[in-house]
């Protein structure tokens, strides 16, 4: 079954997908589409890369990570409820039936009603995230800094977010781990 990822309306959704290229200039074509991965290519394509470039993308979709190192994780900006559904990341490895296909389920939740931001701070400023890719990801640690990909913005809601959003499980299941601090 597909791994589930969550985001709130108005935030950015992050859908992880990785592979290990032979070299930064020797990449594998990748496509992202909305809907289950079909027999070939991607349906309702929203982004596509080739051996060197990101050669197709639509307005709210972009690659959060360094695709030259195989991080083809998709960011969807300013999500709405209509963005909910299954997304396909297809790594188009040369050869017959060699493609790697990942179906990821995105669940969009209505935006939380929050009180006036008296003590609100950017979560990432206080707790820089270290996303360490493992397994099929590039063998390095990347400090992601204050980026709007995981959508945790208030320190006061950190515990609830980690529990409710299944963030830790999501990242673990996708071959990545998250460390706070």
């Amino acid at each position: 079954s597909e791994v589930e990822y969550r985001a709130e309306v108005g935030q950015n959704a992050y859908l992880p997908c990785f592979y290990t290229p032979a070299a930064p200039g020797n990449l594998v074509p990748v496509c992202w589409g909305k809907g289950f991965c079909p027999w070939s290519q991607c349906t309702n394509e929203v982004l596509r890369t080739d051996e060197r470039d990101v050669n197709y993308w639509t307005s709210r979709y972009w690659l959060n990570g360094d695709f030259r190192k195989g991080d083809v994780s998709l960011t969807i900006e300013n999500v709405t409820l209509a963005d909910s559904g299954i997304y396909c990341c297809r790594i188009q490895i040369p050869g017959i039936m060699n493609d790697e296909k990942f179906n990821l389920k995105l669940v969009i939740k209505p935006a939380k009603v929050t009180p006036a931001p008296t003590r609100q701070r950017d979560f990432t400023a206080a707790f820089p995230r270290m996303l360490t890719t493992r397994g099929h990801g590039p063998a390095e640690t990347q400090t992601l800094g204050s980026l709007p990909d995981i959508n945790l913005t208030q320190i006061s809601t950190l515990a609830n977010e980690l529990r409710d959003s299944r963030l830790a499980n999501d990242l673990r299941d996708s071959g990545a781990t998250i460390r706070i601090g």
């Epitope: 020797n26 470039d53 972009w62 959060n64 990570g65 695709f67 991080d71 990347q142 980026l147």
Partner: antibody, heavy 121, light 107 residues
Framework: QVQLQESGPGLVKPSETLSLTCTVS??????????WNWIRQPPGKGLEWIGY???????NYNPSLKSRVTISLDTSKNQFSLKLSSVTAADTAVYYC?????????????WGQGTLVTVSS | EIVLTQSPATLSLSPGERATLSCRAS??????LAWYQQKPGQAPRLLIY???NRATGIPARFSGSGSGTDFTLTISSLEPEDFAVYYC?????????FGQGTKLEIK
Amino acid sequence: QVQLQESGPGLVKPSETLSLTCTVSGGSFSRGGYYWNWIRQPPGKGLEWIGYIYYSGSTNYNPSLKSRVTISLDTSKNQFSLKLSSVTAADTAVYYCARDHYSSSWTFDYWGQGTLVTVSS
Amino acid sequence: EIVLTQSPATLSLSPGERATLSCRASQSVSSYLAWYQQKPGQAPRLLIYDASNRATGIPARFSGSGSGTDFTLTISSLEPEDFAVYYCQQRSNWPPTFGQGTKLEIK
């Protein structure tokens, strides 16, 4: 209009570390898609790509310099930096920062004016 | 890494003449070749990318052609401001590499 501006000391002693900073203005620095590069040009010679940093912090270096190069970024200041250790006279060059986009990888569409760094005791 | 060889090293022409600059790659780079112009004391400026596409704001007198290992930058009618050094650069193989340059000077 995107503008890049290099800054740093113009003179570095042999065996020391060269440090330069590039400040980016008028563009979307903390946004996916853009790669921030360092390229150098020894006096009277051609250009050599040194390395890049992506806004996520991911880096990639020219194998010929990899053991001595570190590129980092400070998104709060719209800056990225180059450190080149154990310099010799062969590292004397004009150092440029430049940008490329993932829709045309390694095609450098915006450059800084360059800063000359001389390695001498 | 791929070596790019530019010729001639220096080209002496007069305004109004046609300039033809050559860049040869040590192995095929398909069409992944760019041309840059550099004037004294200035940064390189992107002219042509992917062998034949003019960058934004580049005059139509600049054109690029070629594929594989042999490429040409043509300036159809030289203007005084075109006298500079021109570099080719490949992005087919990593790392990206540059040619040594052709100096276009006033005859």
